[in-house]
């Protein structure tokens, strides 16, 4: 985040940016930036693997839910979208693409279908779904 | 938008921010930034006038829908929220807080109640509602 004060002094501009204002990012062009994370919602329906590949091709990953506070914008998301949560059959756990385990109480998991992948829907719910089912998806990029 | 190249040369940093990446804002702290507009969703229910006052106190206005392309993040918004659209009984038109008239084909207006204010709901729908009814609301700030 480039603080407004720093930018003002640097460019010696007259524009007064309040101290409470800040820049967000950097993010890929036309992505949503919130609390220094970048999000994009993709309309085209793909299976989980294709969705993952699409996010990876944009230097991002499928949505990881890690904090209700930092990601409270997700409360209001309509419809169902692939996120980066998968079932690891060997130990029965659910984990994110980066290998971290799903924290308890972050998501309410709902039995929708038999499957090893999960869709995100509003109010921090995850819906179990077959990974080969096409769905829209959310990519996410953590800023440095 | 501060382009990555400009920032890199300016600060003489080694960090490689891809050309396609950019900063968004400035926005009030912890607001959503998208295509250089700032948005915030407020959970507390207020009537339209109180919602307007709340946005104004934050140097913002109630949501103005002006472009389906630039505001496509609004497609996926769940639930109903006050926006800055009001009915002008004298000429029967709907206009935004800034006095501009609602462009045709931007919103599908649905008569939910008798009223002079409008709630925003997903997929660019506007629901007519009594202005004194409490609802959650969306504030918006256009960046310079």
């Amino acid at each position: 985040i480039w603080s407004a004060v720093f930018l003002n002094s640097l460019f010696n501009q007259e524009v007064q940016i309040p101290l409470t204002e800040s820049y967000c990012g950097p993010c890929p062009k036309n992505w949503i930036c919130y609390k220094n994370n970048c999000y994009q919602f993709f309309d085209e329906s793909k299976n989980w693997y294709e969705s993952q590949a699409s996010c990876m091709s944009q230097n991002a990953s499928l949505l990881k839910v890690y904090s209700k506070e930092d990601q409270d914008l997700l409360k209001l998301v309509k419809s169902y979208h692939w996120m980066g949560l998968v079932h690891i059959p060997t130990n029965g756990s659910w984990q994110w693409e980066d290998g971290s385990i799903l924290s308890p109480n972050l998501l309410t998991i709902i039995e929708m279908q038999k499957g090893d992948c999960a869709l995100y829907a509003s109010s921090f719910k995850g819906y179990i779904e077959n990974c080969s089912t096409p769905n829209t998806y959310i990519c996410m990029q953590r800023t440095v | 938008i501060w382009s990555a190249v400009f920032l890199n040369s300016l600060f003489n940093q080694e960090v490689q921010i891809p050309l396609t990446e950019s900063y968004c804002g400035p926005c009030p702290k912890n607001w959503i930034c998208y295509k250089n507009n700032c948005y915030q969703f407020f959970d507390e229910s207020k009537n339209w006038y109180e919602s307007q006052a709340s946005c104004m106190s934050q140097n913002a206005s109630l949501l103005k829908v002006y472009s389906k392309e630039d505001q496509d993040l609004l497609k996926l918004v769940k639930s109903y929220h006050w926006m800055g659209l009001v009915h002008i009984p004298t000429n029967g038109s709907w206009q935004w807080e800034d006095g501009s008239i609602l462009s045709p084909n931007l919103l599908t207006i649905i008569e939910m109640q008798k009223g002079d204010c409008a709630l925003y709901a997903s997929s660019f729908k506007g629901y007519i509602e009594n202005c004194s009814t409490p609802n959650t609301y969306i504030c918006m700030q256009r960046t310079v």
């Epitope: 079932h87 059959p89 060997t90 130990n91 029965g92 659910w94 309410t108 998991i109 709902i110 039995e111 929708m112 279908q113 038999k114 499957g115 090893d116 819906y127 179990i128 | -």
Partner: antibody
């Protein structure tokens, strides 16, 4: 505490239908699937199918496909299993059990008390 | 359908004995297997889920393990209340299938 309360004993004629209910309490009904399992007298357990309570989508065992309908009423937190064209070999205790996929929640961690359905002419 | 072959079909043992019941799947089912205990006139009770996870409230003398397509339920030291019928269930694939049951009786 979690409870699944089933409807009472039924006696039916061959060719008739039976509808067994299972009222859930003590948990969020829509979060879990609901499975139906039967057990003929002195026999083992047989999986009939399950319903995603959240969206009402059922998954039936092929053996019962066309004869069984599973539904869920999220207003009353009650699941139903209807079996049609009853035969004498449908005589069994019918159980409802919580869970449908086994992918996240332990499967069948709570069971109803069972409903005896007797098919006899 | 996946066949679950449970053995033995019946077993006599004494209090304090270590008892092992096996289920063999006709194909790979990952760890998608549970074990259930049923007493006469009662609904089954979940003991083990995902092959080796102990359901809460179940005594630690019960354990589950897997080797390939062979799954084992072990009771380390039989107690009087353990005499019952035990079933395995695969939930890897539709239709879910149970083993035919193992009746554990007092010797």
């Amino acid at each position: 505490q979690v409870q699944l309360q089933q409807s009472g004993t039924e006696v039916k004629k061959p060719g008739a239908s039976v509808k067994v209910s299972c009222k859930a309490s003590g948990y969020t009904f829509t979060t879990y699937g609901l499975t139906w399992i039967r057990q003929a007298p002195g026999q083992g357990l047989e999986w009939m199918g399950w319903i995603s309570v959240f969206n009402g989508s059922p998954n039936y065992s092929l053996k019962f496909q066309g004869r069984v309908t599973m539904t869920a009423d999220t207003f009353t937190n009650t699941a139903y299993m209807e079996l049609r064209s009853l035969r004498s070999d449908d005589t069994a205790v019918y159980y409802c059990a919580r869970g449908g996929t086994g992918d996240y929640y332990p499967l069948f961690d709570y069971w109803g008390q069972g409903t005896l359905v007797t098919v006899s002419s | 359908a996946i066949r679950m072959t449970q053995s033995p079909s019946s077993l006599s043992a004494s209090v304090g004995d270590r008892v092992t019941i096996t289920c063999r799947a006709s194909q790979g089912i990952r760890n998608d297997l549970g074990w259930y205990q049923q007493k006469p006139g009662k609904a089954p009770k979940l003991l083990i889920f995902a092959a080796s996870n102990l359901e809460s409230g179940v005594p630690s003398r019960f354990s589950g393990s897997r080797f390939g397509t062979d799954f084992t339920l072990t009771i380390s030291s039989l107690q009087p209340e353990d005499f019952a019928t035990y079933y395995c269930l695969q939930d890897y694939n539709y239709p879910y299938t149970f083993g035919q049951g193992t009746k554990l009786e007092i010797k």
